[in-house]
Interface confidence: low
């Protein structure tokens, strides 16, 4: 028996369901009584789900997994993983035994989009050209780690005096805080872009500093 899986990682959003595809080619006359199917974590061999002795043995993974029982006899051994968590990320092995056996691994990449950045300014009043100001761009609840880019009003990248920190919360999602220190000109716009490298999702935030009080562009 030959097992086939997707070579590309499966990308799943946190709290959505994911399907880890696995298939085999049953011989003529194949019955489910012959099938021994095991899904396990590749690194640790922890059991995730199994089908043995002609029946679905159920989830060994917090009751969040399921097979496609009506499709098994056709050779579809895919696994449904419900309510995906960051901690589900990794490699899963599909093991199929009928008379001989084969196995293959499929990677699950978990992702979560970053929120629209919030911008803060320090100090935020009595600003004059030549003042040093600190602009903080904060974006929340994303995964995996973000890439952060700063630009000025002309679209010129700002790379000096930027400090970015990323902290994982209890769910493993990252909160991103990027700090830009700049010397004010007469006026100017500063924008940050928080990019999720897996989703290719960009979240934008910007702040405009003029001779008048600080203004934020309206929410899109």
């Amino acid at each position: 028996v030959e097992v086939q899986v997707s070579e590309d990682p499966v990308v799943a959003l946190v709290d959505t369901d994911a399907t880890l595809r696995c298939s085999f080619s049953p011989e003529p006359g194949f019955s489910l009584a012959q099938l021994n199917l095991i899904w396990q974590l590749t690194d640790t061999k922890q059991l995730v789900h199994s089908f043995t002795e002609g029946r679905d043995q159920g989830s060994a993974y917090s009751n969040r997994t399921a097979l496609f029982p009506d499709l098994l006899v056709q050779g579809n051994a895919s696994l449904r993983l419900q309510r995906v968590r960051v901690t589900d990320e990794g490699s899963y092995t599909c093991f199929v035994s009928i008379q001989d056996f084969d196995s293959a691994a499929v990677s699950l990449q978990v992702a979560a989009p970053y929120s629209k950045p919030s911008m803060t300014l320090e100090p935020n009043k009595d600003l004059r050209p030549g003042n040093m100001v600190t602009i903080t761009c904060s974006s929340y609840q994303g995964y995996p780690e973000a890439e952060v880019f700063w630009k000025d009003g002309q679209g010129v990248p700002l790379t000096g005096n930027v400090t970015t920190s990323q902290m994982a919360n209890e769910r493993g999602l990252f909160d991103v805080h990027s700090v830009l220190r700049v010397v004010l000109g007469a006026n100017g716009t500063y924008s940050c872009l928080v990019r999720n490298p897996v989703l290719q999702q960009d979240a934008h935030g910007s702040v405009t500093i003029t001779g008048q009080p600080l203004t934020f562009p309206p929410e899109a």
Partner: antibody, heavy 119, light 113 residues
Framework: EVKLQESGPGLVKPSQSLSLTCTVT?????????WNWIRQFPGNILEWMGY???????SYNPSLQSRISVTRDTSKNQFFLQLNSVTTEDTATYYC????????????WGAGTTVTVSS | DIVLTQSPSSLAMTVGQKVTMSCKSS????????????LAWYQQKPGQSPKLLVY???TRESGVPDRFIGSGSGTDFTLTISSVQAEDLADYFC?????????FGGGTKLEIK
């Protein structure tokens, strides 16, 4: 706030069994994560002993496989370590520890309990 | 089993100095599927439990000061304290979280002069 608290006898005789309890508060051990036992020998060497996952499956260090059992009581939100046929070499501080899912790094540690094996 | 070797076994530094300590693995800890290195660093102050500082070789745990910097890939890893403080007096351990059995290095003891 998550807390892990080890308890059990501080003195065990050679050839007997060592039994420890970890009581978890602030988080259900059936919700997520792996719940581990790690010990630290005199001289500060750390050894991972094994875990029981939130789904109830266990994995052990092969060096202890024949002597170790990690079980749990979900109604009390506790998990347990049993180590059989102890020798003086099992004298150590024993920690119960939570690891983030399958990532196997250790984010929450109990305070530890010292067990001396001596006759 | 994966063996982790830490060096030096001890070092004494003065407040404000930069500290580097090494952890070498007997096997590659880089997971090619996600390009992450499965190595963690812990700090253990006298009389306390170990505390997670860094995982995946360079990701700082929440609340850890940014003077603690993890780096490296494959088999060679480094923990740097950019400007050591008196409260950093502790033992530091590396741990591979690549595969079971999970293993730790022998530790580096940091003393403050």
């Amino acid at each position: 706030e998550v807390k892990l608290q080890e308890s059990g006898p501080g003195l065990v005789k050679p050839s007997q069994s060592l039994s420890l309890t970890c009581t978890v508060t602030g988080y259900s051990i059936t919700s997520d994560y792996a719940w581990n036992w790690i010990r630290q020998f005199p001289g500060n060497i750390l050894e991972w002993m094994g875990y029981i996952s939130y789904s109830g499956s266990a994995s052990y260090n092969p060096s202890l496989q024949s002597r170790i059992s990690v079980t749990r009581d979900t109604s009390k939100n506790q998990f347990f370590l049993q180590l059989n046929s102890v020798t003086t070499e099992d004298t150590a501080t024993y920690y119960c520890v939570r690891s983030l899912g399958r990532r196997w790094y250790f984010g929450f540690w109990g305070a530890g309990t010292t067990v001396t094996v001596s006759s | 089993d994966i063996v982790l070797t830490q060096s030096p076994s001890s070092l004494a530094m003065t407040v404000g100095q930069k500290v580097t300590m090494s952890c070498k693995s007997s096997q590659n800890l880089l997971n090619s599927s996600n390009q992450k290195n499965y190595l963690a660093w812990y700090q253990q102050k006298p009389g306390q439990s170990p505390k997670l500082l860094v995982y995946f070789a360079s990701t700082r745990e929440s609340g850890v000061p940014d003077r603690f910097i993890g780096s490296g890939s494959g088999t060679d890893f480094t923990l740097t304290i950019s400007s050591v403080q008196a409260e950093d007096l502790a033992d530091y351990f590396c741990q591979q979280h690549y595969s079971t059995p999970l293993t730790f290095g022998g530790g580096t003891k940091l003393e403050i002069k």
